[in-house]
Structure formats: C-alpha cells, structure tokens
C-alpha cells in the first residue's frame, strides 16, 4: 500500500514520515470530555489505559476536511458531543490532520492518501488488542475527510464496519476510479450524504454516487436556509462563500440531527433521479426502497450506488413529512398546453398544513393522472380533508378575448376549466394510502381563482399496502 501511496504523491518528502508528524489521533471518551492530551500513538498502549479506551465498544473516527481557518471547526465539536450523547460507551477519536489540510486545496488533496494510511496503521495496531473489532469501527469523514476515510478503509488489514461520507469533496475526485476516492469497497457499509452538488460551475461536493447508499437531501443541491437571502441577510454583509459553507456543511448537521433527534428521524426514498423524486413518484418502502438517514441509515442487501432523496426543513430538527398526491385532471375540451398553478392545504387530526404549492416538474397531463410531491414541516396526524386551489393568473387581452368568444359559443364551461373527482394520497413516513373525494360528485370542476374541497372517502387505493419505514427500520 505504501508503494502505491508514494506514487500518488507529488514528492517523496510528503510521504508517511511527514504524515506521522502531521496526523494526530485525539481520543475523546465520555468519562473525560474536556480532558486534553489523550493522544493515541501506534505502539503506545499507555494512553489507551489513561484515557479509558473501551476495547469492546464502538469506535468512531471523525475526519475533518480541507480548512481555511487552521483550527478544528465548530461542526466537529458538535458532532463529537452528539456521538457521545448517543453512544455513551463509545470511543470517539478526532483525526487531526490540520497541518496538511490547512494548505492549498490541491496540496491537501495530495495528502489524503497518506493521512488515510496513517488512520489504517492506527486501526491495524488497535486490531492487535484484545476485544477490539474492526467491525465496530465507524469512520465519519467530512468533505476531503470522506476520501481520507475511503483510503483508510482501503489500506487497513480487514474490513471496517462502516464509513459515512459527509458531502465528500468533488474537485479532483469526481469521475475518478474507485481506488482514488471513497467507494463501496472501502467498508462493509458506506453511506453518503450529498448536500452541495452542482451540475454547473464547480461542485464542491461530489455528484456521483460513491457508497452503498447515496442520499441527496433536497436533490443534493439547494439546501433550504442556505439561499443568498437566508445566509447573507443583506447582500452587503456576506459572501457567496457563506452559502457554499452552509450547503456543504449541511451534511454534517443532518448527521448530528440524526444522532440527537432520535424521536424525529428523517427518511430517504430510493429514486433514479431528483426530477422523478420531485414528481412524487418515489415514496415507496418496498424492497428496501426507503431508509433512515445519517446515523440511522441501515445496511441493506442492495448492491451499491443506490440513490436516495428526501426533503428537509431549513434547520434542526430537519425532518419533514412527505406525501405523494395523485390527481387525474379531466378536460372536456382541447385547451392546449396549460400551466396552472395549484395549491393544496392539508387538514389532519393534529394540525393543518401551510398552503403548499404543487410543483409541476414538466407539464400537466390532461385526461391523465399526475403525480406530485408535497411535504409539511409539522406532523398533521391522520389526514381528514384537502383544499385544492387554482391560483388565478394574469392573462393577456388575447387570452381573455379567446375565453369570451369561447363563452359565447358554449356559455356553460369556461375554456380554462378542469374536473377533478378525487385525490389519492400516500404518506412516505407511514406508507398509508388514502383517497379523498369531492363532497358532491356533481361539483368536480375548478377554474382559475377557485377552490375545491376533498374529504377522506377511503382507506387505501384499493391496492396492496406497502410496508412502513417505521416497521422496516
């Protein structure tokens, strides 16, 4: 592995000897969270005893990424605390490679393999201790640190239990072969959160799937609460860099959320791409098609590179409640291509939702069933009724003249009118299916500026129920 490693570096002086001095393993145990100087060093058993290293417990290695500040950043402290709170007996080891990470990005990239080797050597040494099992090791790497974790998993003798990649770095890793980046071969289970992927410009986070499961919250690109307006408040005070940091670091905070808000777990759903997810097509939990995110992700029998999606709130707790809505729009005349703006309000036993927009990903299919994704920040309880509103849009004089002429020739139906008899709803979180019908079967039509009410009329869609994520996970 070292020969292979040397080949990937720019100069020999950047090799293992340099890394040894530049990589430190700081052990944090719950027994002494503020204790300083608990450094692990290959071949030195005393710190393991002094710092109460628990050989039979889970061991987490947290690996930071490239840094501009030269200090361990805030997210790391919170992640340490969250892990200690969730896994009280666990060993938490911070892999401090700041001297190599606080360099030009390209130089830091060139150091990832040597740091990975350093982590692997530590793990190889620990494996010689009674009770220590590589299966209990969970490497958590953020940004460049995710690839360091991958190299560690590749170089170690045996197989690490789990690697979590928190928005693995994109530049210089996108599209390269599996031996030069984090990949599913690096651990028994590799789960990845992608929060800053871009199809244009530089993608700070890697776009391609690199794990067994790859989760793309909010499509993996624009994170709520990280827009220019949210982050900068007023343009005069901020920089685009703050938006980048917010979206890139969101992966860490989603992971922390999964540790501390156990009662509010977020679920992700398998889908081939973000657009299909936005259409609401992918809310199934059959055949391991849904999973918890972050710490709550479960190893599945799926092969690899399973892409999963979910929506989130702008802050902790990030959980939202996903609903698939199926609506068949009947049109009694050829109205051409229409782009209506629909809103729904969901009413449940616990609460009512805000007014939710039905996002039209492509265009409305007339005389066809259309699928939409809506999500709420609050738990509505059991759904009881739905209000559907067609927003009145401003139209040109020509449109109005056409509609007026149409009305003269057929006065009973405005041209822009659709009929909806029922709405079928499926909850992503409970996997329950419900059907909502109009109160009066004679009054199913809706035109711009109007609303229609639908009331629960049937449990299910007259189809076989699917398993719920709460049961499966």
């Amino acid at each position: 592995a070292e020969e292979q490693l040397e080949g990937g570096l720019r100069t020999a002086k950047d090799g293992p000897a340099a890394a040894k001095a530049a990589v430190r393993f700081h052990l944090r145990t719950s027994k002494g969270p503020e204790r300083e100087g608990c450094y692990l060093s290959v071949g030195h058993s005393q710190p393991l005893e002094d710092c109460s290293f628990n050989m039979t417990a889970k061991t987490f290695f947290i690996i930071h990424g490239w840094t501009m500040s030269g200090m361990l950043e805030n997210w790391l402290h919170k992640l340490v605390s969250a892990l200690q709170m969730r896994e009280k007996d666990a060993n938490v080891v911070v892999v401090d490679w700041l001297p190599l990470a606080h360099q030009l990005y390209t130089d830091a990239v060139n150091s990832t393999r040597v740091v990975g080797l350093s982590v692997a050597k530590m793990l190889d040494w620990l494996q010689g201790k009674d009770g220590f099992s590589l299966g209990n090791v969970h490497l958590i790497g953020y940004s460049l640190g995710a690839h360091v974790a991958g190299f560690a998993g590749n170089f170690v003798k045996g197989t690490v239990g789990r690697i979590t990649g928190l928005d693995p770095a994109g530049p210089m890793f996108e599209g390269v072969d599996i031996h030069r980046r984090l990949s599913p071969d690096d651990a028994d289970f590799v789960d990845v959160l992608h929060t800053y992927t871009r199809s244009f410009g530089i993608s700070i986070g890697i776009q391609m799937p690199v794990g067994h499961i790859d989760i793309y919250p909010n499509g993996g690109d624009f994170q709520p609460g990280c827009g220019l307006n949210d982050v900068l408040g007023s343009i005069a005070y901020g920089t685009i860099a703050e938006v980048v940091k917010c979206e890139h670091e969101r992966a860490v905070h989603l992971f922390v959320d999964s540790l501390v808000n156990q009662d509010k777990p977020s679920f992700a759903f398998q889908c081939t791409d973000s657009n299909r997810f936005k259409k609401g097509i992918c809310l199934s939990c059959r055949k391991n098609r849904c999973n918890g995110i972050g710490y709550n992700a479960k190893k599945t029998r799926n092969k690899r590179n399973t892409k999963m999606y979910l929506k989130t709130r702008a802050g902790m707790p990030f959980r939202v409640y996903h609903y698939q809505m199926k609506i068949h729009f009947f049109s009694y005349k050829s109205v051409g291509a229409i782009e209506p703006t629909f809103y729904v309000t969901l009413y449940g036993t616990n609460a009512e939702s805000q007014v939710l927009s039905l996002e039209i990903v492509e265009q409305i299919g007339l005389n066809a069933t259309n699928t939409f994704l809506v999500y709420t920040e609050e738990d509505l309880g059991d759904l009881l009724k739905i209000k559907l509103t067609w927003e009145g849009t401003s139209r040109s004089w020509y449109d109005l003249w056409r509609e007026f002429r149409s009305y003269l020739s057929q006065p009973h139906r405005p041209e822009r009118e659709l009929s909806i008899r029922r709405i079928r709803v499926k909850s992503g979180e409970t996997q329950r299916r419900l059907t909502f019908c109009v109160e009066d079967p004679e009054k199913t039509s809706i035109a711009p500026g109007q609303e229609l009410w639908f009331y629960k009329c049937r449990d299910g869609w007259r189809m076989k129920n699917e398993t719920s994520p709460t049961v499966e996970l």
Partner: antibody, heavy 119, light 106 residues
Framework: EVQLQQSGPELLKPGASVKISCKAS????????MHWVKQSHGKSLEWIGS????????SYNEKFKDKATLTVDKSSNTAYMEFRSLTSEDCAVYYC????????????WGQGTTLTVSS | ENVLTQSPAIMSASLGEKVTMSCRAS?????MYWYQQKSDASPKLWIY???NLAPGVPDRFSGSGSGNSYSLTISSMEGEDAATYYC?????????FGGGTKLEIK
Amino acid sequence: EVQLQQSGPELLKPGASVKISCKASGYTFTEYTMHWVKQSHGKSLEWIGSINPYYGGTSYNEKFKDKATLTVDKSSNTAYMEFRSLTSEDCAVYYCARYGNYVGYFDYWGQGTTLTVSS
Amino acid sequence: ENVLTQSPAIMSASLGEKVTMSCRASSSVHYMYWYQQKSDASPKLWIYYTSNLAPGVPDRFSGSGSGNSYSLTISSMEGEDAATYYCQQFTSSPYTFGGGTKLEIK
C-alpha cells in the same frame, strides 16, 4: 491553573510597529489555537486572527491582514502579535484568547494590552 | 461578514426581575456564544453552544435560539449580573461579536 499573561501597555508614535506577547501556562500550549481580539475604547470586540501553535497555521480577518502578523515561540509557550504602520485607529486594548481545539470556544482570555498611538 | 446586532444596547433591571437580551445575526449561524465583561476586566466565557453554561455561571442564566435569532435570559437579576454581555459566532470567518448589551441595576 490556566493563565494567559500579556505584555504591558505601549505608547508609540504613528507609523511605528509593536509586538505584543501572550505567555501561556497551565496547559499544553500546542493543543489550543490562540486568537487575538481588539477592543477599542468603549466599543465592542473585533476578531483579528488566529494561530495554531502546533504547526504555525494562521488565519486572519481580511480587515487586519496587512496590519497584523501572528507568530508563536513553542519553546517559551508564547504567542506574539506584531502590529505595523500604527495610526490613532489602532488605539485599543488587545486580548489574546485560547480556543480549545477540542471544545470550540474562547475559554480563557489574557488580561489585555493597552496600545496608545500618539505623536 | 456576519453582523450580530444586540438589543437593547443598554438596559436596567431591578433585583429579582427577569431579564432578556437578544442577538440577531444577519446570516444564519449554527451556535451562539455569550461573554460577560465587567469594566476594566477581560471578557469571560458565559454561554457556549447556544445554551450551555460555562463553569461557574449561575443557573439563573440561560441561552436559547436558532438560525438568526438568539437570546440570553436571567431568571432573577442579582447585583453581580450587572455587566456588558457580548454575543459571538464561529460559524463563518471573520468570527464576529455583537455590539454588546450593557446591563445595569435599576
């Protein structure tokens, strides 16, 4: 007991340079990033920059990039801040504060060094 | 840079009174930190990670908030609480402080 002992007050002329020291004791010097903070008279606090004594890595507030230089002497557990091209705007109290690399906040502060610039 | 605005700038409270001061960030922050400073003294860490009290801080103090809005509360004002309190963020560089809230005894 953790202590950050700063050098005494300075009275200097405009255009001069000054080097303020902050001697650390009671903890392992290389385990904590040292930060420097400015407080003008009756005003709030401004972050100047930081240095990681373990390997000398620095980070600066853009506003002070051309004004301040941060260094450390590991053998004497001392952090330094050099301020150059002094003007009356630099009159303030300067604090060093340690940032726990494994806890993430300014947990101990120096007593402050008063800098007066006057012709 | 992320501008932190503290309000009120100056406030006075009677002994035993409940006191709340706020800190608003122009950009969202993950955690807020509070420092207490008395005249001619260095600032002291008072609250970290938004709601954790630093060692030695009386439990009549509490911190809360998220996103852009944070606050420090004293459940029952005591004489020794008269000081200036600064909020501070580490979410993005440059790390900034609020203008301070000076708390006086009425």
